[in-house]
């Protein structure tokens, strides 16, 4: 799995982003782990990465993953100063020049290396569930999340806001 | 334009209820996270309550857990502070504020101007 | 519980000085901060967040830096109407305020 070392190779360069044409307005590392408190691991393997939902061993290094926060302008026809209707949209990278990418054809989440601009499949919504949990909507289909299935990362459909609070589309990020 | 306008302050004795309103126009009131926030005469800032946009998940200040309520009507465009068994250290002003973001709890893009609430015997 | 602690208390500078407030966490915060502004008598106003992004409207005189525990906000030119009582805020972990510093012309 990658440890940090992975990460400390991005230079103070921030990403574009193809939802606004601008820099990040945020980045910092974090590691991501299910509500339940399994890690999301990375790890190469046959020349792709893999990614894993994992309880880690006692002592065992978690994973860092690059968040980078966008500002998107909502598609709606509120007033305002351009302040009201925004959305956050998050980029997620575990090592340089790979990042988390939604693949909706498989529902699946796969680690793609690719060149910025990012592809939309790279963006997801950010929500906050709870004060310290997010879920990540896909950019590319609304209703759709990242969530926990199998001991691995897929994408889920959530039909109702009442299904939000699954516990299994809810993830905590922390920097240790 | 956003607005947020707060109502039901106002001077009520120790132990006893008080229920604050806050209507909002001008945004898409079910997209935000909305929130309670206090100030004491003279004093700072205080977090009270926190309401995610679809009204599930509810934050309080340790100090007020048990006694306050937070809710909302998202048809009605209204969030609700309900107090109960009231004390003199909830004397303040009451601020209603949105968040920055649909469905995230990041920042207070806008404020109310806030309603009085005096705790006295 | 997160913690804020700003400093100074009160700051008081001539018209046209460059101004630096502090805020310090007790943890770890991953620039998710905020710069309030409260003039008397008035509501507080979104000034700077995520740590150095300005709120649309707001002069640009205002700036915002800091990472991991500490954070600054700065006014590079201090004008009369900047009187008012600042507010760091932190929503990283909870949501937690600074005590607030308050900034009076000379």
């Known amino acids: 799995a990658f440890g940090i070392s992975g990460v400390q190779k991005y230079t103070r360069a921030l990403h574009d982003s193809s939802i606004t044409g601008i820099s990040p307005i945020t980045e910092y590392l974090a590691s991501l782990s299910t509500y339940n408190d399994q890690s999301i691991t990375f790890a190469l393997e046959d020349e792709s990465y893999e990614i894993y939902v994992e309880d880690l061993k006692k002592d065992e290094k978690k994973d860092k993953v690059l968040l980078s926060y966008y500002e998107s302008q909502h598609p709606s026809n509120e007033s305002g100063d351009g302040v009201d209707g925004k959305m956050l949209m998050v980029t997620l990278s575990p090592t340089k020049d790979f990042w988390l990418h939604a693949n909706n054809k498989e529902h699946s989440v796969e680690l793609h290396k690719c060149e910025k601009p990012l592809p939309d499949q790279a963006f997801f919504v950010l929500h906050n569930m709870h004060s310290n949990c997010v879920s990540f909507e896909c950019k590319t289909d609304p209703g759709v999340f990242i969530g926990v299935k199998d001991n691995h990362l897929a994408l889920i459909k959530v039909d109702s806001s009442e299904n939000l609070c699954t516990e299994n589309i809810l993830f905590k990020l922390s920097e240790t | 334009e956003v607005q947020l306008v707060e109502t039901g302050g106002g001077l009520v004795q120790p132990g006893r209820s008080l229920k604050l309103s806050c209507v909002a126009s001008g945004f898409t009131f079910s997209n935000y996270w909305m929130y309670w926030i206090r100030q004491a005469p003279g004093m700072g800032l205080e977090w009270v309550s926190s309401i995610n946009n679809d009204g599930g998940n509810t934050y309080y200040l340790d100090s007020v857990k048990g006694r306050f309520t937070i809710s909302r009507n998202n048809a009605e465009n209204t969030v609700y502070l309900q107090m109960n068994s009231l004390r003199s250290e909830d004397t303040a002003t009451y601020y209603c504020?949105?968040?920055?973001?649909?469905?995230?709890?990041?920042?207070?893009?806008?404020w109310g101007q806030g309603t009085l609430v005096t705790v006295s015997s | 519980d997160i913690q804020m602690t700003q400093s100074p208390s009160v700051l008081s500078a001539s018209v046209g000085d460059r101004v630096t407030l502090s805020c310090k966490a007790s943890h770890n915060i991953n620039k998710h901060l905020d710069w309030y502004q409260q003039k008397v008598g008035e509501a507080p106003k979104l000034l700077i967040y995520f740590t150095n992004n300005l709120q649309t409207g707001i002069p640009s005189r205002f700036s915002g830096s800091g990472s991991g525990t500490d954070y600054t906000l700065t006014i590079s030119s201090l004008q009369p109407e900047d009187v008012a009582t600042y507010f760091c805020?932190?929503?990283?972990?909870?949501?937690?305020f600074g005590q607030g510093t308050k900034v009076e012309i000379k």
């Open positions: 805020f932190q929503y990283n972990s909870g949501w937690t």
């Open positions: 504020a949105k968040g920055r973001y649909y469905y995230s709890s990041y920042s207070f893009a806008y």
